[in-house]
């Protein structure tokens, strides 16, 4: 069964800067990745970035840099201030559309006890939805 993992890290140098890493553990070919915050995309969440392997990358503030790390994982750097700034309990979600498995989404947030610059290991997060 495919799984999605989500890792959230607060940067020690910039406390308003977060790095989100997401990966897909499956054998299919990824056709689209959507990163959102505040909940799953389409269920109250706000889209931060969309990554298409053959068309490119689209991102919205406060996303600063979205990129593919491997064929099955992505990273997103967020930075902001005021209303657009992420906070420690913000939930980030990643949705992977893959053929033939379909769409798989998982969410994560900064570990409650984590110090700036630290993060939880990228273990698979609970799968919220599989279309």
């Amino acid at each position: 069964t495919p799984e999605v993992w989500v890792q959230v890290r607060m940067e020690a140098t910039e406390l308003s800067s977060f790095t989100i890493r997401c990966g897909f553990l499956g054998s299919g070919s990824i056709s689209l990745v959507t990163v959102s915050w505040g909940g799953p995309n389409g269920a109250g969440g706000t889209t931060l970035a969309v990554l298409h392997p053959e068309r490119g990358i689209r991102q919205w503030a406060p996303a600063r840099q979205a990129r593919w790390e491997t064929q099955s994982s992505i990273s997103l750097i967020l930075e902001g201030s005021g209303a657009s700034s992420p906070c420690a309990n913000t939930t980030f979600c990643c949705k992977f559309a893959s053929f033939p498995e379909g769409s798989w989404e998982a969410c994560g947030s900064l570990p409650p006890s984590s110090d700036p610059g630290l993060s939880a290991p990228p273990t698979p997060a609970p799968i919220l939805r599989a279309d």
Epitope: L51, P53, R55, G56, I57, R58, Q59, W68, Q71
Partner: nanobody, 118 residues
Framework: EVQLVESGGGLVQPGGSLRLSCAAS????????MGWYRQAPGKDRELVAT???????KYVDSVKGRFTISRGDAKNSLYLQMNSLRAEDTAVYYC????????????WGQGTMVTVSS
């Protein structure tokens, strides 16, 4: 399918300048890496310069200080300002785009000829 169209090539004297342009058909997504490659007669195609959508730039040593790559205000427009041109810069210049930066799908323009000759 992303289409790339180059323009700006031509005949120029040694020491002269040219500005190449490349327009991409993709207007929703940012293409992660765009670049210029060139192929001189009888030689292999070689990298000239690349730029990511976040502004990270690389040049081949032979053009450093003479060529400047940039991306325009229009999404996925690409430029190459070529100064102090030399005879050895004569080649067909190709625009290249790698939307993911992973090489999963790479697009090429049809090329524009640059001839440096007196």
């Amino acid at each position: 399918e992303v289409q790339l169209v180059e323009s700006g090539g031509g005949l120029v004297q040694p020491g002269g300048s040219l500005r190449l342009s490349c327009a991409a058909s993709e207007t929703y997504f940012d293409l992660y890496v765009m670049g210029w490659y060139r192929q001189a007669p009888g030689k292999d195609r070689e990298l000239v310069a690349t730029i990511t959508y976040t502004g990270s730039i690389k040049y081949v040593d032979s053009v450093k200080g003479r060529f400047t790559i940039s991306r325009g205000d229009a999404k996925n427009s690409l430029y190459l300002q070529m100064n102090s041109l030399r005879a050895e810069d004569t080649a067909v210049y190709y625009c290249n785009a790698d939307p993911s930066g992973l090489g999963r799908k790479v697009y090429w323009g049809q090329g524009t000829m640059v001839t440096v000759s007196s």
